[in-house]
Amino acid sequence: THLGIRLPLRSGLAGPPLGLRLPRETDEESEEPGRRGSFVEMVDNLRGKSGQGYYVEMTVGSPPQTLNILVDTGSSNFAVGAAPHPFLHRYYQRQLSSTYRDLRKGVYVPYTQGKWEGELGTDLVSIPHGPNVTVRANIAAITESDKFFINGSNWEGILGLAYAEIARPDDSLEPFFDSLVKQTHIPNIFSLQLCGAGFPLNQTEALASVGGSMIIGGIDHSLYTGRLWYTPIRREWYYEVIIVRVEINGQDLKMDCKEYNYDKSIVDSGTTNLRLPKKVFEAAVKSIKAASSTEKFPDGFWLGEQLVCWQAGTTPWNIFPVISLYLMGEVTNQSFRITILPQQYLRPVEDVATSQDDCYKFAVSQSSTGTVMGAVIMEGFYVVFDRARKRIGFAVSACHVHDEFRTAAVEGPFVTADMEDCGYNIPQTDESTLMTGRA
């Protein structure tokens, strides 16, 4: 997934207490037992800092070595720093683990910018604020890297939660979540609530902030409001989905829906931005500019480079439009839409202006590898990765940042014909097509 532009975090959670849940529709109750309910021990188990990803605490080896690991639904390797590096406070020391097993195999992962390489092995892994299990999992011990680790990010490795097809060096290397499900009775499902800051955080706040929740094995009611809407996973490699329509403030971009998914659309927690194919990005920016034309912003702002600053507390959210993505539904000719606010796609940046100003980057950017629904999208929603039923669920997050006038939304159903035609069929080429990193 690696990295590029990552995201802000929120201090505390805005979710209602368990006794004050909104009434919800019951069409989800058909799910098998144990997959829904309360996962108190896992709530608030993610942290992170602005633009640098969300991480969970994990332990590896015997005796356990504690590391912070970036949660990445856009890759499939469990890889951890295993040698000294200027940006790492700690790293996995294989020689200190009595349960480490060397697979005598190397792995090399290049990105568009940067790379990591390492040695494959297996060891015992657990998640302290996760299910009470220990599993033997594949680990890539990173021995060399370039532009991979981020100075001050506080994470030392990456947990790739996608499917084996995109694992390196090949699909025979079982990803962590597959190992977890195989070796335990944990249901084949996890869910993510990423909580963006909505305001710039200083260093102290950022380090102390709660970033969200990764619920392993099910769905936690307290993390969302309203109902969950599901879109099929088109193919089990990345978490690939199909977008059938895009609107800016309710205005349809009116593009051939294939363009929205050219060459794929994925849900990726390891990418900060909402990334759109070139043609779609250009149309979206044109529409966002038109909607916000009472003010004009510099060219570099729309490129995600320049920061626009307003007097603290006076950011004119109302002049920026909402962005709606319509996703293929589970029923034929039915779709639903997810709508994000400028509070999601304008990313607060700290340390650039005076304390009297709030500064933001535009967090929608151009992609040459398809649509990437990164943290900008995910911070609005509770996202359920229902691998067992090959679908991804979206509901309004209990911690999303909004104002008194607008809120993020998940709404449906909408009648949409010929949705299958919206998917792009990638010509089969060699493995090198997977070598582009994500910004």
């Epitope: 009472t294 912003f297 510099p298 570099g300 480079e305 340390d351």
Partner: antibody
Framework: QLQLQESGPGLVKPSETLSLTCTVS??????????WGWIRQPPGKGLEWIGS???????YYNPSLRSRVTISVDTSKNQFSLKLSSVTAADTAVYYC????????????WGRGTLVTVSS | EIVLTQSPATLSLSPGERATLSCRAS??????LAWYQQKPGQAPRLLIY???NRATGIPARFSGSGSGTDFTLTISSLEPEDFAVYYC??????????FGGGTKVEIK
């Protein structure tokens, strides 16, 4: 070609309000391509940005002056104006109006400037 | 807040010599940096924008370079009219607001 010209009193008493107008000729303050700004320079010192305005009236101010500054635009007269209240001797400076161009990121055209002295 | 530090404060050179002026940002401003020239009793004039692009009508002897935190304005061969004060300004944070303290280029 486009020109900017500042006008207003050269002497203002302490605690009063400094008022300046910038008249744009050879161009239009209603252009969607530009912001319009005020910058000042105390005698023998560096440049200090005061604030900027768009044709819609949308304004941005220097945080250190924000509580005292008002910038407005009158597109029908092709003018924009600066008001700085509760002035002190520290506000004595040459005041420049300028156009913000080149991707609205830089001050690409300036007026000649007008010296405003704050003194009783 | 991004702070721009210019050095040296004063540069004493003779006509025909090469002038190298430095502007350092307290954190990266990418390439969003401009240089202005101000002669005594005149308004500043934009010389260079986006770190290296010459503004309209600026002679080729003026060139800008750098990105991130370190920037340089070079005058390849000083003409008599080039003796002035030079300011840098960043616009990574918008609206453009921050100027450096200036470098005075004087005749030796």
């Amino acid at each position: 070609q486009l020109q900017l010209q500042e006008s207003g009193p050269g002497l203002v008493k302490p605690s009063e309000t400094l008022s300046l107008t910038c008249t744009v000729s050879g161009g239009s303050t209603s252009s969607s391509s530009y912001y319009w700004g005020w910058i000042r320079q105390p005698p023998g010192k560096g440049l200090e940005w005061i604030g900027s305005i768009y044709r819609s009236g949308s304004t941005y101010y220097n945080p250190s002056l924000r509580s005292r500054v008002t910038i407005s635009v009158d597109t029908s007269k092709n003018q924009f104006s600066l008001k700085l209240s509760s002035v002190t001797a520290a506000d004595t400076a040459v005041y420049y109006c300028a156009r913000v161009g080149h991707g609205i990121s830089y001050f690409d055209l300036w007026g000649r400037g007008t010296l405003v002295t704050v003194s009783s | 807040e991004i702070v721009l530090t210019q050095s040296p404060a004063t540069l004493s050179l003779s006509p025909g010599e090469r002038a190298t002026l430095s502007c350092r940002a307290s954190q990266s401003v990418s390439s969003y940096l401009a240089w202005y020239q101000q002669k005594p009793g005149q308004a500043p004039r934009l010389l260079i924008y986006d770190a290296s692009n010459r503004a309209t009508g600026i002679p080729a002897r003026f060139s800008g370079s750098g990105s991130g935190t370190d920037f340089t304005l070079t005058i390849s061969s000083l003409e008599p009219e080039d003796f002035a004060v030079y300011y840098c300004q960043q616009s990574l944070t918008w609206p453009p607001r921050t100027f450096g303290g200036g470098t005075k280029v004087e005749i030796k």
